[in-house]
């Protein structure tokens, strides 16, 4: 697994003219694990990065990802409750210049090297689920979430709101 040392925590203005497109309002480092406490790890294999879901040994260090939070450009009122906040989307970067991407054709989650502005496939709508868990919904494919399948990350279609709490799309964020 590779570390986050190449990623600098830095502060940006909300509308930074030096960056094309929107800029994150908040960024911080966190490790990502499944509902069942398996760790999401990243490894360089054959000149490409692979993503694994695995149990770590007792003292093995967790990989960190840089979580960047972006405000949508319009208020989100799909619930009809008059909430005036703007919907948040996140990008996840485990190492410098690489971001998690949704490959909707292959129903897979991949690490791609890319430059700003990031493509829509790198953005995920953040959901709060039960037990301090979050879920990541594809910006490019509403109703499709990052999930766990066969010890890998995959894209999983969620058909109804009752299935939003299915364990394989629930993740925990930890800063320790």
């Amino acid at each position: 697994a590779f570390g986050i040392s190449g990623v600098q925590k830095y502060t940006r203005a909300l509308h930074d003219s030096s960056i094309t497109g929107i800029s994150p309002i908040t960024e911080y480092l966190a490790s990502l694990s499944t509902y069942n406490d398996q760790s999401i790890t990243f490894a360089l294999e054959d000149e490409s990065y692979e993503i694994y879901v695995e149990d770590l040994k007792k003292d093995e260090k967790k990989d960190k990802v840089l979580l960047s939070y972006y405000e949508s450009q319009h208020p989100s009122n799909e619930s009809g409750d008059g909430v005036d906040g703007k919907m948040l989307m996140v990008t996840l970067s485990p190492t410098k210049d690489f971001w998690l991407h949704a490959n909707n054709k292959e129903h897979s989650v991949e690490l791609h090297k890319c430059e700003k502005p990031l493509p829509d496939q790198a953005f995920f709508v953040l959901h709060n689920m039960h037990s301090n868990c979050v879920s990541f919904e594809c910006k490019t494919d509403p109703g499709v979430f990052i999930g766990v399948k066969d010890n890998h990350l995959a894209l999983i279609k969620v058909d109804s709101s009752e299935n939003l709490c299915t364990e394989n799309i629930l993740f925990k964020l930890s800063e320790t």
């Epitope: 908040t26 009809g80 709060n128 979050v134 320790t176």
Partner: nanobody
Framework: QVQLVESGGGLVQPGGSLRLSCAAS????????MGWHRQAPGKQLELVAV???????NYADSVKGRFTISRDDTKNTVYLQMNSLRAEDTAVYYC???????????????WGQGTLVTVSS
């Protein structure tokens, strides 16, 4: 509806201290992070500090070692202790929170109205 109310701003001399508070209220189900941004006259909005639900923090380089962010989860309140204040810290300080409400799982960004901090002799 989620409301953020800031307090604690004011006039302080260089080298002095202030403590800002921000209380979140409304139909809050889960808070992911709470933080502070600031906007100085003629400047862009910038992140000052953020604290996550797990207790992780991130600071702007310009305030590291001088400002401390903390959070009281039981009150959905975030604090910013500002020490060794400088003239360049003069700005309107805005509270920002990422949270979901009882009516939707989607996480949204909410902002307070801001509180003015003036550092001047």
């Amino acid at each position: 509806q989620v409301q953020l109310v800031e307090s604690g701003g004011g006039l302080v001399q260089p080298g002095g201290s202030l403590r800002l508070s921000c209380a979140a209220s409304g139909s809050i189900r889960t808070v992911n992070y709470m933080g502070w941004h600031r906007q100085a006259p003629g400047k862009q909005l910038e992140l000052v500090a953020v604290v996550t639900s797990g207790g992780g923090t991130n600071y702007a380089d310009s305030v590291k070692g001088r400002f401390t962010i903390s959070r009281d989860d039981t009150k959905n309140t975030v604090y910013l202790q500002m020490n060794s204040l400088r003239a360049e810290d003069t700005a309107v300080y805005y509270c920002n929170a990422a949270a979901s409400t009882y009516s939707s799982t989607v996480v949204r960004s909410f902002w307070g109205q801001g509180t003015l901090v003036t550092v001047s002799s």
